[in-house]
C-alpha cells in the first residue's frame, strides 16, 4: 500500500540517520540580543542525520522520492530530516512597555522525520 | 523579529534554488503496478533545489537552522527544501471486490519551503 | 538533587510589609525562571509572576502588577516575594515553582510559605 | 474565575478509571501544551503530566494526558487510594499568561 510502515532502524549505524539533537545556542549566536532578554541560552533540538531509502518516511511523498532517488539520483534529491513536530518555547523579551513573556510554537523540534 | 520575511528571490542564479519541479513517473517506478491501474504514468510534484541563507524559511526554526548552519556548519545541517503542501491525487486501484476510487492527500506536493 | 526551600510560616498585622524567600540548590539557579502561585484559603492556584534570577528581569500576571515585588539574588541562589502593605486578602500560601527547560511548565515546587494576616 | 474549566470534583472506586478534563480557548489550550499538577492533602503541588501527554520520572503509568482542540484530559487508571487529591491544569493564555484551572477534587470511594 501507499502508506507503508516507516523503516525505523538505521541501516547506516548508530546516531547517523535522522534524529533529534540538542545544540546549544546563545541570544548572540541566533542575533537576538537586541529584543530577546532571557533566556540567555537555548537549548534547540534540532533535527539532523541521514535518509536512507524508506527510514521515518513523513508520507507517501516521501516515499515516491526515496524510490525515485534510486532511479533518478541526479534529478530527484533523496528525502532530507525535518521536524514533524514543534515545542513551545517561551521567551521573555523587551517590548516599549519593558517586558513580556511570549510563546514561540514552532522554534524547537520535538521530533523529525524525512520528508 | 523572529518571524523576519522568508527572502523570495535566489542568490545562487536562476533554477538553482527550492522549488517545484514536475518528475515524470510511471507505476513500475513507483512499484506500485500491481495493485494502481490508472493513471499509468504520473507527473509528480517534486521539491528541489537549495537553501541558501533565509530563502524561503518554513518558519522561526528554519531561520535559526540556517543562521547556525552558517556559525557552525559542521554541526548544524541547512535547512532543505520540502513540501509546504499537498495537491490530491485520485487513483484508481485494484481491491478484493473489485476496483475502486481512493484520493491521496500527500502524494504529490504543491509548494515547497525550506525547512 | 533540586529543592526550592521557602522560608517559614509568617502572621502579619494590615499595613505591614514583608519579604518572602525561596531558595534554590542541586540545579545552576541562573539558568532557570522562578516564578510565584498563590493559593487562598480552600481554593486554587493562582499564577503571579516570573522572574529571571539571570538578568533580574520580571513579568507580574495583570492580577498582582503593582501589588507585589518579585526580585531574586544570584550570588546565595534565592528568590523573594515581598509586599510593602499587606491586606487581610492577602492571606494565602504562596509557593515558589522552577520553571522547565522551555518556559511552559513548573516542574519543581517549594514546599509553599503560609502568610496569615490579621488584625 | 478561571480561564480554564474543570469540574470541582470527581470520584471513583479502587480500581476504577476516571478523567478529569479541562476546557480552554484558542487563546490557550487551544495553541500551546497542556500541564498537569497534583496537590495531596497539605502538600505543594506537584507536576504530574507535561506538553500534554509527558510524564516525568516517578510518575507512574497509570496517569496519562492528552488533548484535542481546545479542551484536555488528565486519565488516571487502577485507581488507588492514594490518588484522593487536588487535580490542576495549566496552560498559558496571551491575555493573562500562565494560567490554571479552577481544580478538580478527586475522591476515592470505599
Known amino acids: 500500500s501507499a502508506h507503508a510502515h516507516p523503516r525505523d532502524s538505521c541501516p547506516l549505524g548508530p546516531g547517523r540517520c535522522c534524529h533529534l539533537e540538542t545544540v546549544q545556542a546563545t541570544l548572540e549566536d541566533l542575533g537576538w540580543s537586541d529584543w530577546v532578554l532571557s533566556p540567555r541560552q537555548l537549548q534547540l533540538s534540532m533535527c539532523v542525520g541521514e535518509c536512507p531509502h524508506l527510514y521515518r518516511s513523513a508520507n507517501t511523498h516521501a516515499q515516491i522520492k526515496a524510490r525515485l532517488h534510486g532511479l533518478q539520483p541526479d534529478k530527484v534529491p533523496a528525502p532530507c530530516c525535518v521536524p514533524s513536530s514543534y515545542t513551545p518555547v517561551v521567551l521573555m523579551h523587551r517590548t516599549d512597555s519593558g517586558v513580556s513573556l511570549q510563546t514561540y510554537d514552532d522554534l524547537v523540534a520535538r521530533g523529525c522525520h524525512c520528508a | 523579529s523572529a518571524h523576519a520575511h522568508p527572502r523570495d528571490s535566489c542568490p545562487l542564479g536562476p533554477g538553482r534554488c527550492c522549488h517545484l519541479e514536475t518528475v515524470q513517473a510511471t507505476l513500475e517506478d513507483l512499484g506500485w503496478s500491481d495493485w494502481v491501474l490508472s493513471p499509468r504514468q504520473l507527473q509528480l510534484s517534486m521539491c528541489v533545489g537549495e537553501c541558501p541563507h533565509l530563502y524561503r524559511s518554513a518558519n522561526t526554526h528554519a531561520q535559526i537552522k540556517a543562521r547556525l548552519h552558517g556559525l557552525q556548519p559542521d554541526k548544524v545541517p541547512a535547512p532543505c527544501c520540502v513540501p509546504s503542501s499537498y495537491t490530491p491525487v485520485v487513483l484508481m486501484h485494484r481491491t478484493d471486490s473489485g476496483v475502486s476510487l481512493q484520493t491521496y492527500d500527500d502524494l504529490v506536493a504543491r509548494g515547497c519551503h525550506c525547512a | 538533587e533540586v529543592q526550592l526551600v521557602q522560608s517559614g510560616a509568617e502572621v502579619k498585622k494590615p499595613g505591614e510589609s514583608l519579604k518572602i524567600s525561596c531558595k534554590g540548590s542541586?540545579?545552576?539557579?541562573?539558568?532557570?525562571?522562578i516564578g510565584w502561585v498563590r493559593q487562598m484559603p480552600g481554593k486554587g492556584l493562582e499564577w503571579m509572576g516570573v522572574?529571571?534570577?539571570?538578568?533580574?528581569?520580571?513579568i507580574y500576571s495583570p492580577s498582582f502588577q503593582g501589588q507585589v515585588t518579585i526580585s531574586a539574588d544570584k550570588s546565595i541562589s534565592t528568590a523573594y516575594l515581598q509586599w510593602s502593605s499587606l491586606k487581610a486578602s492577602d492571606t494565602a500560601m504562596y509557593y515558589c515553582?522552577?520553571?522547565?527547560?522551555?518556559?511552559?511548565?513548573?516542574?519543581?515546587w517549594g514546599q509553599g510559605t503560609l502568610v496569615t494576616v490579621s488584625s | 474565575q478561571s480561564v480554564l474549566t474543570q469540574p470541582p470534583s470527581v470520584s471513583g472506586a479502587p480500581g476504577q478509571r476516571v478523567t478529569i478534563s479541562c476546557s480552554g480557548s484558542?487563546?490557550?489550550?487551544?495553541?500551546?501544551?497542556v500541564n498537569w499538577y497534583q496537590q495531596l492533602p497539605g502538600t505543594a503541588p506537584k507536576l504530574l503530566i507535561y506538553?500534554?501527554?509527558n510524564r516525568p520520572s516517578g510518575v507512574p503509568d497509570r496517569f496519562s494526558g492528552s488533548k484535542s482542540g481546545t479542551s484536555a484530559s488528565l486519565a488516571i487508571t487502577g485507581l488507588q487510594a492514594e490518588d484522593e487529591a487536588d487535580y490542576y491544569c495549566?496552560?498559558?493564555?496571551?491575555?493573562?499568561?500562565?494560567?490554571f484551572g479552577g481544580g478538580t477534587k478527586l475522591t476515592v470511594l470505599g
Open positions: 484558542s487563546s490557550n489550550i487551544g495553541v500551546l501544551y
Open positions: 506538553s500534554n501527554d
Open positions: 515553582a522552577r520553571y522547565g527547560r522551555y518556559g511552559t511548565y513548573f516542574d519543581y
Open positions: 495549566q496552560s498559558w493564555d496571551s491575555s493573562s499568561n500562565y494560567v
Open positions: 542541586g540545579y545552576s539557579f541562573t539558568s532557570y525562571w
Open positions: 522572574i529571571d534570577p539571570d538578568g533580574s528581569y520580571t
